[in-house]
Interface confidence: medium
Amino acid sequence: VTLRGSNYTSKYLGMTLATDPTDGSILACDPGLSRTCDQNTYLSGLCYLFRQNLQGPMLQGRPGFQECIKGNVDLVFLFDGSMSLQPDEFQKILDFMKDVMKKLSNTSYQFAAVQFSTSYKTEFDFSDYVKRKDPDALLKHVKHMLLLTNTFGAINYVATEVFREELGARPDATKVLIIITDGEATDSGNIDAAKDIIRYIIGIGKHFQTKESQETLHKFASKPASEFVKILDTFEKLKDLFTELQKKIYVIEGTSKQDLTSFNMELSSSGISADLSRGHAVVGAVGAKDWAGGFLDLKADLQDDTF
């Protein structure tokens, strides 16, 4: 059997095996998916789901995979300027971005900001930020576009037109995108160009009251959705969101933590144990949450998981 779909070397695939008694499918995991991030070793899992007798297509996933956030971070705010936003709501988005930038002003973060609606406008790029690290001044001429919500196009615009060395992006930096929107996309397409960007999405307001509407945001965010998609019912709650982001992007207060002292999924060893029943896979993550351990509930396609 030829296994495709992973850029990582797997040494221990099959160390964990589980079969589904209902249809004979097999889950094979390697809990030793190892890589280095700023001198820290990350350890998570790599799992494959095979049909009975190893026939037909197989699924591959990386449960508990923690993205590497290196010392230098280039962060783009991609913020909604559609007509459904009231000026006070739009102002709260600007205030949130300013707050993040002010709190991270003495770190290895660089910022850029893009407003999107029907079209896209770079309000300031990384070079502008380096020249003048004053968020109030950088955002004082933002003109609310008041048109549609072309999210697919906007993400592609950021990937191709903002993360550019000639505009101040650093080749060694981790690319992070924070998308802030109050509505579902009015365009369609794919975001393949942004695959190497860590993507958070914040959906705010009355248009995200249903589970279906919330799930429309998942395709724009990195996985797992539980980590990278945030739904807020009011714009006021943006004020409290920074603390949560700070926990997620753990190097947020300095240049680079060379020696991690607390862990979420960095050393999860997910896939150390597994259960498969009626097509539903659960894997053990012994090193999660400072080695408190726990289980990861895998989605059917193995592309997402919940702790």
Partner: antibody, heavy 121, light 107 residues
Framework: EVQLQQPGAELMRPGASVKLSCKAS????????MNWVRQRPGQGLEWIGM????????RLNQKFKDKATLTVDKSSSSAYMQLSSPTSEDSAVYYC??????????????WGQGTTLTVSS | DVQITQSPSYLAASPGETISINCRAS??????LAWYQEKPGKTNKLLIY???TLQSGIPSRFSGSGSGTDFTLTISSLEPEDFAMYYC?????????FGTGTKLELK
């Protein structure tokens, strides 16, 4: 609570320079344009201009370009308007007002009480 | 500059009545008109912006309509505290300009 505090009255002699003040509180002073508006006795409102406290960028109504100079002091969250060579024509109520920069221009969501300037010999 | 003509200059009405104040711009200003209330001893209050959007905290008896050059502020079922001076302001282009004002008096 957003507040813009202005002195109630100023009395000046013609020709003497006058500097009107507006102290802001209850919001991020450097995050909003500060505007100045004039109201002469028995007349309507006239927009003088606006300043952004973050970097003191100023936009003035051409009508007031030789009359008004706008400044800010970030440390005290205060905005100032200096009127050059005041005459009795400059006697008016002067308001400061916080601007909401919307679709490229501005309307005002909070106003000061206004300073009544009397220029008289 | 955009000139704004506001009418009427004076308006007398009784509590419970519905009144309308008009503003006409010398050229099209799209929908970008704001309305303010001025009362002695109080700071000016923003009522409406963008022609028809009610500022938060303003009672729903205030409403705005119009686009292009002609705009209307309507106050339905007048309350005693509504008797005041009203101004419109265009926020479509610089320099920002105001209407001449309407004094709403108790009949």
């Amino acid at each position: 609570e957003v507040q813009l505090q202005q002195p109630g009255a100023e009395l000046m002699r013609p020709g003497a320079s006058v500097k009107l003040s507006c102290k802001a509180s209850g919001y991020s002073f450097t995050g909003h344009w500060m505007n100045w508006v004039r109201q002469r006795p028995g007349q309507g409102l006239e927009w003088i201009g606006m300043i952004h406290p973050s970097d003191s960028e100023t936009r003035l109504n051409q009508k007031f370009k030789d009359k008004a100079t706008l400044t800010v002091d970030k440390s005290s969250s205060s905005a100032y308007m200096q009127l050059s060579s005041p005459t009795s024509e400059d006697s008016a109520v002067y308001y400061c007002a916080r601007g909401i920069y919307f679709y490229g221009t501005t309307y005002f969501d909070y106003w000061g009480q206004g300073t009544t300037l009397t220029v008289s010999s | 500059d955009v000139q704004i003509t506001q009418s009427p200059s004076y308006l007398a009405a009784s509590p419970g009545e519905t009144i309308s104040i008009n503003c006409r711009a010398s050229k099209t200003i799209s929908k970008y008109l704001a309305w303010y209330q001025e009362k002695p001893g109080k700071t000016n209050k923003l009522l409406i912006y963008s022609g028809s959007t009610l500022q938060s905290g303003i009672p729903s008896r205030f409403s705005g309509s119009g686009s292009g050059t002609d705009f209307t502020l309507t106050i339905s079922s007048l309350e005693p505290e509504d008797f005041a001076m009203y101004y419109c302001q265009q926020h479509n282009e610089y320099p920002l300009t105001f209407g001449t004002g309407t004094k709403l008096e108790l009949k």
